[in-house]
């Protein structure tokens, strides 16, 4: 058993069928020593007296909140929930996986550019009853500090006959330092609650192996003199780190087709500008990537040919 | 460069966004299935990290750029002597067209770049590495691989600000 | 040395489900994927899966979705692969091998008959 | 789902003498500097053992008569000079993409 935080304790049990459980003892928060009572959440039948109360957790009936009397008032709480283990695992029944970039993937994060601030955000189709909390650090053995805001939900989407709620939370790096090479990951940890239920998520990752850039902007065409051929030009990001001489970006500049069928044509280049031909009904898309390391690409910004 | 002269930052520039390539087509992180299982441990706390107070960023490089291309330098060496060690050259062989052959030489090309001949910085030693399992080098290789696709980054934004804003 | 001790042959009915162990030693159970591989009698070898142990998430040949479910628990260094809903195609000996990331299948257990008989 | 054809299905060696086996995959299996291809001895009753892997690399114990080559889509397993206890069935996996698959096998005898 540990403390979660003040009189919220958390009780991790191996779950399985006639498991014994977790003795627990519970300690009444009070100078008062005789003609003390103990009772469960809305319940007035009294489980047992004395300073301490001692209870043989294995289920979820058995957590909830404890709280000791004395002659009708109440002394303290302590709110108990239960942490399962199946099969050496912890379980992940609040969250829902997102198998990207990989299984067992709870928490997603995205980082517009190199300042030390992110976005993370997970999936649950639980609507009340649910907590999270979240807190963060660059590496574990000697952390260095970053600061988390509240999770927030964020989006509401009906998958089927499910609706699923998408939580996110926005993290800074106390003292970042953009051009450097990182060496320690940042660690993000997500403690959840539904009901009497406890989980915990982790994720580990570098800021440059999230980057996901905001799609260009100011996209613009202007057509050529006596030619098929448009000039395409855009500018970086607003979010993109500066300078841009440091900061680089690379991009993809594709002409797309009505029917997705369509060959597209995709030209790479380091500049703002490209020389495409524009066919009917066609589109222009450009995106972004970090010029000199690997991470995701931009979403496309779009235009019409026409 | 040692002793304070300018590099030839335009030459620095191709060859680092080079190195990036090469770097990424030696192990192209994307969709692995093995990367998880790559373990979160450091390949070695021995490697050379571009670090905040090492003045590779804009304004360092416009105060005093030695300070930085001196640790690119020796991140550079450090990362060359690898390339060459047994963790690369013995068993499992590399395909005759594999990139890291390239990056090797790169590597090489543009630490020369940055110290022609005749001209000493102090290099790092590399540690002795080499695990007895081929498995545990060919894991080793993949996480080396890693962690210069970071410095290369680094290095690569460098010289392109450099270029830019410091060329003569 | 490392090992992988496979558990012994099992005679199911039909329609039933039979769960084989694999016990690993001499190296860290959570190091690598632990594959599994069926071999029907004078053919060759399919591959059915993979956990990892160290975060427990399997990965399954399309073919076995929903035959087999593959577990691991760590207290134990065990991997186990149940299969349900029984068929005489299901008939054959199952191999465990342990496999170090971006290598080959280099361990291989004894193997386990399963014969599906009424 | 990548496709390993073996061939011959099986072949009979003298004592002494070259065995070849090929296994062709239906795309390439080579990515990085690596061919991620392997190759098994299997013999009857007993598990595969593991014999060389990355398509040339001799797993630590395995006679120096073995020798894998090949790159991209064609792969060799050659023997030689082949002996009594290499009678047995190989087979070659590969390790691409998931989901691995394995080659048909192919049967040694020895003359």
């Known amino acids: 058993i540990w403390e979660l935080k003040k009189d919220v304790y958390v009780v991790e049990l191996d779950w399985y069928p006639d498991a014994p459980g977790e003795m627990v003892v519970l300690t009444c928060d009070t100078p008062e020593e005789d003609g003390i009572t103990w009772t469960l959440d809305q319940s007035s039948e009294v489980l047992g007296s004395g300073k301490t109360l001692t209870i043989q957790v294995k289920e979820f009936g058995d957590a909830g909140q404890y709280t000791c009397h004395k002659g009708g008032e109440v002394l303290s709480h302590s709110l108990l929930l239960l942490h399962k283990k199946e099969d050496g695992i912890w379980s992940t029944d609040i969250l829902k996986d997102q198998k990207e970039p990989k299984n067992k993937t709870f928490l997603r994060c995205e980082a517009k550019n190199y300042s030390g601030r992110f976005t993370c955000w997970w999936l649950t189709t639980i609507s009340t009853d649910l907590t999270f909390s979240v807190k963060s650090s660059r590496g574990s053995s000697d952390p260095q500090g970053v600061t988390c805001g509240a999770a927030t939900l964020s989006a509401e989407r009906v998958r089927g006959d499910n609706k699923e709620y998408e939580y996110s939370v926005e993290c800074q790096e106390d003292s970042a330092c953009p051009a450097a090479e990182e060496s320690l990951p940042i660690e993000v940890m997500v403690d959840a609650v539904h009901k009497l239920k406890y989980e915990n998520y982790t994720s580990s990752f570098f800021i440059r192996d999230i980057i996901k850039p905001d799609p260009p902007k100011n996209l613009q065409l202007k057509p050529l003199k006596n030619s098929r051929q448009v000039e395409v030009s855009w500018e970086y990001p607003d979010t993109w780190s500066t300078p841009h001489s440091y900061f680089s970006l690379t991009f993809c500049v594709q002409v797309q087709g009505k029917s997705k069928r369509e060959k597209k044509d995709r030209v790479f280049t380091d500049k703002t500008s490209a020389t495409v031909i524009c066919r009917k009904n066609a589109s222009i898309s450009v995106r972004a990537q970090d010029r000199y390391y690997s991470s995701s690409w931009s979403e496309w910004a779009s235009v019409p040919c026409s | 460069v040692p002793g304070g002269s300018s590099p030839a930052w335009t030459q620095c520039q191709q060859l680092s966004q080079k190195l990036c390539t090469l770097a990424w087509s030696a192990h192209p992180l994307v969709g692995h299935m093995d990367l998880r299982e790559e373990g979160d441990e450091e390949t070695t706390n021995d490697v050379p990290h571009i670090q905040c107070g090492d003045g590779c960023d804009p304004q360092g490089l416009r105060d005093n750029s030695q300070f930085c291309l001196q640790r690119i330098h020796q991140g550079l060496i450090f990362y060359e002597k690898l390339l060459g060690s047994d963790i690369f050259t013995g068993e499992p062989s590399l395909l005759p067209d594999s990139p890291v052959g390239q990056l090797h030489a790169s590597l090489l090309g543009l630490s020369q770049l940055l110290q022609p001949e005749g001209h000493h910085w102090e290099t790092q030693q590399i540690p002795s590495l080499s695990p007895s399992q081929p498995w545990q080098r060919l894991l080793l290789r993949f996480k080396i691989l890693r962690s210069l696709q970071a410095f290369v980054a680094v290095a690569a934004r460098v010289f392109a600000h450099g270029a830019a804003t410091l060329s003569p | 040395q490392v090992q992988l001790q496979q558990s012994d042959a099992e005679l199911v009915k039909p329609g039933a489900s039979v769960k084989i162990s694999c016990k690993v030693s001499?190296?860290?159970?959570?190091?690598?994927?632990i594959h599994w591989m069926k071999q029907r009698p004078e053919q060759g070898l399919e591959w059915i899966g993979y956990i990892y142990p160290r975060d427990g998430y399997p990965k399954f040949n399309e073919k076995f979705k929903g035959k087999a479910t593959l577990t691991a628990d760590k207290s134990s260094s065990t991997a186990y692969m149940q299969l349900n809903s029984l068929t005489s195609e299901d008939s054959a000996v199952y191999f465990c091998a342990r496999r170090p990331p971006y290598y080959a299948m280099d361990y291989w257990g004894q193997g386990t008959s399963v014969a599906v008989s009424s | 789902d990548i496709v390993l054809t073996q061939s011959p299905a099986s072949l009979a060696v003298s004592l002494g003498q070259r065995a070849t086996i090929s296994c062709r995959a239906s795309?390439?299996?080579?990515?990085?500097?690596?061919?991620?291809i392997h190759w098994y001895q299997q013999k009857p009753g007993q598990p595969p053992k593991f014999l060389i892997y990355?398509?040339?690399n001799l797993d630590s114990g395995v006679p120096a008569r073995f020798s894998g080559s090949g790159s991209g889509t064609d792969f060799t397993l050659n023997i030689h000079p082949v002996e009594e206890e290499d009678a047995a069935t190989y087979y070659c996996q590969h390790s691409r993409e998931l989901p691995y698959t394995f080659g048909g096998g192919t049967k040694l005898e020895i003359k």
């Open positions: 990355l398509a040339s």
């Open positions: 001499g190296y860290t159970f959570t190091d690598h994927t």
């Open positions: 795309k390439s299996v080579s990515t990085s500097g690596y061919s991620y």
